[in-house]
Interface confidence: low
Amino acid sequence: HHHHHHEQKLISEEDLGGEQKLISEEDLRAPRCRELPAQKWWHTGALYRIGDLQAFQGHGAGNLAAPISGLKGRLDYLSSLKVKGLVLGPIHKNQKDDVAQTDLLQIDPNFGSKEDFDSLLQSAKKKSIRVILDLTPNYRGENSWFSTQVDTVATKVKDALEFWLQAGVDGFQVRDIENLKDASSFLAEWQNITKGFSEDRLLIAGTNSSDLQQILSLLESNKDLLLTSSYLSDSGSTGEHTKSLVTQYLNATGNRWCSWSLSQARLLTSFLPAQLLRLYQLMLFTLPGTPVFSYGDEIGLDAAALPGQPMEAPVMLWDESSFPDIPGAVSANMTVKGQSEDPGSLLSLFRRLSDQRSKERSLLHGDFHAFSAGPGLFSYIRHWDQNERFLVVLNFGDVGLSAGLQASDLPASASLPAKADLLLSTQPGREEGSPLELERLKLEPHEGLLLRFPYAA
């Protein structure tokens, strides 16, 4: 059953006695294949947020202001990242803090025209990249939801959902919903419109909150809502705390499909030191749910390294000319171009992880079991039926240490073998493909390992 699924019938002796059937001994021995879950496109890989289209374009060709058409030229790059959806914008007209001058149906001409957008949708469709539109109304203003005119704004959102669904978008995002009065009921209504149009459409809500109770109350009345929050950014970047956050979340949400990110909009570098970026990439791609990244996360884009750049939307570094403001500020290894040519780069790691995430059954929809390991470590298994299984071991700490994997925590269906093959390490120097003895496994500081092993009956 490796990488495929077919229906198998359980056959009783009675069946055999009656009608003559050609059934081999192997057929009788083979356990029944587990039925595949229904998977939507956002279950199959990562989402990629482009909150500021002008910053994404880079400064190379001047301060670019029709970036929707420029984005079309970057779709091949997004395909190379194997991301499944693009979360775009907001791109609608919004005069800051002015409800009357906020039109969710009109594209701000600084971003391009409707013809640019239609063309982008068509091109993205051809490349199997879905487009999710951010409709956060007052994105240029103080309060994203114009706190005093909630009903007016909610009506505008409703109209916009219907309009953009007709226009062919694949989903929507609304952020800062902690500022939206009666958020749960509005989200339920917007979810109904979105899903009423097609079950294949997605609604993402974002909140700055990291409080599990607040998050649960938003999820409670909204099944299938994908929620991004600051929940994981509270981990203090320690293994034990991250493990407890992840397992608490999965338990509290009843293992419903979720998304994983460190915030609703910001870059990983806003929360993490450079040495933990690889570890977090590995974790986000291998937890059960949809990983959500911001443009630049794949190269470790860091606003702090670019003088004068806004923290929330630094310029994307395509090559060394992307930030001409200060000559020499950008070295090749900070850019897409430079990292594309380096198999050991963060970008290369991102591409490999994204590829695995989008094709391996155990990572696509496999069960998740966390288990005990050495101090500062977070380790878990992903497995699905008789497909290849994955073991993830993450060392958040500053010191190298033995993995100390406590396999006794695991259920019988997810037991550990004596050896597993190294698929990849976040650090250089290990021989990929080599079998590692799990009892003797040691990890370098900040190292994450992705190991694979076969199903054994």
Partner: antibody, heavy 125, light 108 residues
């Protein structure tokens, strides 16, 4: 307000080239495609193609391919249209134009709303 | 490409009269993307109607547009002296964008 100001009239000999400029003001130059059109004396309007000032991408109609080059200089918010190997039947007024995005009853629209004043190019031996 | 044919070529009318101009397309045009322009001698065209029937900003309400598919009409309900000019229809729904050959509205 939006203004498109074109360069002055030109007289050219057959086989020569002409380069017409169109300086934009009153809006973000790189935010809109610039379209070029021509109108022979006493004739109708003919669309030649566009340039995306943002990226420099161009789209020319087949009739002009190989003879027309549209460029831009974002630092001075100016678009250019160069027509080479001129013939006498290229005598025309050339216009640059920009769309305006309208929205009504659920439909976006982008007709050519803003036009330059036109540049007369006379090709004569 | 879509060919637009305008009729009549010339329309001779007096001020105060109603003018009806026709534009026929060689294949169906999305009514969302049909425009009408007015051009006076020595001037650039001026947008009157877009989306077949919506008046552009600042255009008086004596100008109206209608039609769908392949047949479109521009109507000037009461001609004013300043309305005597050449009128062009244009489709911008599919590339290449094309114009009709124009209808001249002249004073009788």
């Amino acid at each position: 307000q939006v203004q498109l100001v074109q360069s002055g009239a030109e007289v050219k000999k057959p086989g020569a080239s002409v380069k017409v400029s169109c300086k934009a003001s009153g809006y973000t130059f790189t935010g809109y495609y610039m379209h070029w059109l021509r109108q022979a004396p006493g004739q109708g309007l003919e669309w030649m193609g566009w340039i995306n000032p943002n990226t420099g991408d161009t789209n020319y109609i087949q009739k002009f391919q190989g003879r027309v080059t549209m460029t831009r200089d974002t630092s001075i918010s100016t678009a250019y249209m160069e027509l080479s190997r001129l013939r006498s039947d290229d005598t025309a007024v050339f216009y640059c134009a920009r769309i305006r995005v309208y929205y009504e009853s659920g439909i976006y629209n982008y007709p050519l709303h803003h036009w330059g004043q036109g540049t007369l190019v006379t090709v004569s031996s | 490409e879509i060919v637009l044919t305008q009729s009549p070529g010339t329309l001779s009318l007096s001020p105060g009269e109603r003018a009806t101009l026709s534009c026929r397309a060689s294949q169906s045009v999305s009514s969302s993307y049909l425009a009408w322009y007015q051009q006076k001698p020595g001037q650039a065209p001026r947008l009157l109607i877009y989306g077949a029937s919506s008046r552009a900003t600042g255009i008086p309400d004596r100008f109206s547009g209608s039609g769908s598919g392949t047949d479109f009409t521009l109507t000037i309900s009461r001609l004013e002296p300043e309305d005597f000019a050449v009128y062009y229809c244009q489709q911008y729904g599919s590339s290449p964008w094309t114009f009709g050959q124009g209808t001249k509205v002249e004073i009788k």
